[in-house]
Interface confidence: medium
Amino acid sequence: QDPWAAEPRAACGPSSCYALFPRRRTFLEAWRACRELGGDLATPRTPEEAQRVDSLVGAGPASRLLWIGLQRQARQCQLQRPLRGFTWTTGDQDTAFTNWAQPASGGPCPAQRCVALEASGEHRWLEGSCTLAVDGYLCQFGFEGACPALQDEAGQAGPAVYTTPFHLVSTEFEWLPFGSVAAVQCQAGRGASLLCVKQPEGGVGWSRAGPLCLGTGCSPDNGGCEHECVEEVDGHVSCRCTEGFRLAADGRSCEDPCAQAPCEQQCEPGGPQGYSCHCRLGFRPAEDDPHRCVDTDECQIAGVCQQMCVNYVGGFECYCSEGHELEADGISCSPAGAMGAQASQDLGDELLDDGEDEEDEDEAWKAFNGGWTEMPGILWMEPTQPPDFALAYRPSFPEDREPQIPYPEPTWPPPLSAPRVPYHSSVLSVTRPVVVSATHPTLPSAHQPPVIPATHPALSRDHQIPVIAANYPDLPSAYQPGILSVSHSAQPPAHQPPMISTKYPELFPAHQSPMFPDTRVAGTQTTTHLPGIPPNHAPLVTTLGAQLPPQAPDALVLRTQATQLPIIPTAQPSLTTTSRSPVSPAHQISVPAATQPAALPTLLPSQSPTNQTSPISPTHPHSKAPQIPREDGPSPKLALWLPSPAPTAAPTALGEAGLAEHSQRDDRWL
């Protein structure tokens, strides 16, 4: 049996659980999956936590990887620090443990990177491109307390079956998080159902004390109760419902008050009617009907964009006028042609360099010795349906022999889609892409939102935009931290990311080579660090009250939400962006997230130098999204990955190591 055919499994302690999901996902998809269950990607910060992860992962198959919650934004290297500039998805950089598989590399680290854990061996940490769908992911769930596993009783028909709040069912838990249900079957044919609940005296415990398989109060058939049967002192039974449900009129069954609630967006049990309706951030309750939600127009907020702003349902977007380009903050504009454009100019001849002649290598690229060794992984392949992401790894698959038209790729993600509820938005219908010139905006129809020039003053505290995912209807508000993210329009089915290789135009990117280290790397670096963050560290978390960068560029934004349409170049003037590509970023057509491949969300990087541009730095639409890991959008990638053996790490006193030898790496897709 292939061990990876296993079901998800978990290991719980008194205050948290780790769960392994052997499901192939990108970093963003994994992050979302953990969040939807109320957790986060695993953040093993101490040797003790790492040990728990090790015992859960066990000796998995060789060559398998699991995402953990570590991510680094572009140009955020801090190689001297234990986490090397990586940030936990919880938003901080505290750690007392690292387990890097590779020595830290020098270089400017121009692209976003994420960390995966080897499922075999010493479970080392490998850094690489976030868009690869690796073999699984580790989630972590924190809670207020846990109940110990029930002791087996003489009258039990079998072990207790536990169901956790994150939907894992097993008999193997040692601790059960608050909110778990234990089902005990007795030999007499009846059973008991217990809930791990808060106790009146404090702490948590099982809703009922043993013995469970004696007496007749709730027998047979759980006293007829749908959820929980309680034996009262006088011998009669009463039924109770688990949290979020209420007892129905029959006194036995339980109903979800939100199941029939007429809330347009979000519903929460409780309140006088049994439920209360809420709107996602970016929306507010309609004045005439509190069940409905109407869009908030952020473009009315002074200084939200430096130059021009367009509001759309659930979000807004900044654009710059011709001759300017949108900076990484998605708000500011700077004169076009600043640093960064040349970086990709001369790559073509090097991309497929077989590494025989190191003298020919561009020194700027030689520095990338750190990341996953480029295995050929997914060679780009022709899409048969929209791909999960515009990139995915491994060496790109070549395709048709004609050169492909490179399209600019937004580097900011789309709003998160509803995990289970189909997303229906009042989207604009467009029959062709809209190209907007800075002087004469061309609007596709009368329904197009107005283009509003933005004023320049900095945002005051009360004008800061809480940006939480417009498309995340079913997450409880507790799971939606207020973090800036940006939407990323869908790519049309025939979309090709920009080509860098002039040598091999027939090779088009699709899957990026996994940047995983050669498994022959010697010298695992397992390092224990003192926890704590240097005082000048600013975590990459923009909270609801955080200042948005005040400088805003002269940009204009046009964003249409529509069903997926082909990009058709037109003769109309295109907006200037940092990508050197024939198609304007105004050709972005966003698709309801439920129908489009997930794109990659982005935090506004507070530490990123504003004058730095990556080789492709397209528009940064702002979407209201929870704090989600930033995924720099599809970058141009190599058509082929020609990796070479990873350097052997020679651990130093700090647990980091210099390169034992200079290994030529191909991180040039970044």
């Epitope: 769908a133 073999d135 060679l379 780009w380 048969t384 070479s644």
Partner: antibody, heavy 120, light 107 residues
């Protein structure tokens, strides 16, 4: 136990079409990229096509591009190879193979193969 | 395409001997080379992936090495069941290409 079983082979006339199937079991089919590899009688191995785990991307060797289509149905745990405009050069045993990793392209499990003979 | 040249085409050996099979790529493929074993009438079996990593269940008498263009498969103590055909595969560039094979046979 990981199992791949090909079917659909046989004798076909040049210019005609044929579809091969590969039934997968013993692993989470939707987690793995899959491929077809062929071997002409008394000859070596030749990679034909690969499809990603989610079916979103495919690739083919030049000699079959435009004639062969690789596809998958994760609900049925089945991989397909639609072969059109067959020629005698396509005569071979066709193996269904699993790419064993999310980031390496090695083939860790192979089916027993199904023989396709293109002859008039 | 990247051509994989295997040598020798046929390798006479004796039981218990140590043999080395070679595979040379026409261009650098990093460590993206595998070795497969094929018994007549059966499908190929993965022995070594990414140049040097033994697949699950493969006896440790099989070892792979190399990177760039030159790769070797070493069988340290040949057994009777090893007298079959061995193929190398590269996936550092498209199309994926196999070598023509080396047949291990008794002297």
């Amino acid at each position: 136990e990981v199992q791949l079983v090909e079917s659909g082979g046989g004798l076909v006339q040049p210019g005609r079409s044929m579809i091969l199937s590969c039934a997968a079991s013993g692993f989470t089919f939707s987690n793995f990229d899959m491929a077809w590899v062929r071997q002409a009688p008394k000859m070596g191995l030749e990679w034909v096509a690969t499809i990603t785990y989610d079916g979103s991307r495919t690739n083919y060797r030049d000699s079959v591009k435009g004639r062969f289509t690789i596809s998958r149905d994760s609900a049925k745990n089945t991989l397909y190879l639609q072969m059109d405009s067959l020629t005698s050069e396509d005569t071979a045993t066709y193996y269904c193979a699993r790419h064993g990793s999310s980031y390496y392209w090695f083939f860790d499990f192979w089916g027993p193969g199904t023989m396709v003979t293109v002859s008039s | 395409e990247t051509v994989m040249t295997q040598s020798p085409t046929s390798m006479p050996t004796s039981i218990g001997e140590r043999v080395t099979l070679n595979c040379k790529a026409s261009q650098s493929v990093g460590i993206n080379v595998d070795w497969y074993q094929q018994t007549p009438g059966q499908s190929p079996k993965l022995l070594i992936y990414t140049a040097s990593n033994r697949h699950t269940g493969v006896p440790d008498r099989f070892a792979g090495s190399g990177s760039g263009r030159d790769f070797t498969l070493t069988i340290s103590n040949v057994e009777a069941e090893d007298l079959v055909v061995y193929y190398c595969l590269q996936y550092g560039s498209l199309p994926f290409t196999f070598g023509a094979g080396t047949k291990l046979e008794l002297k």
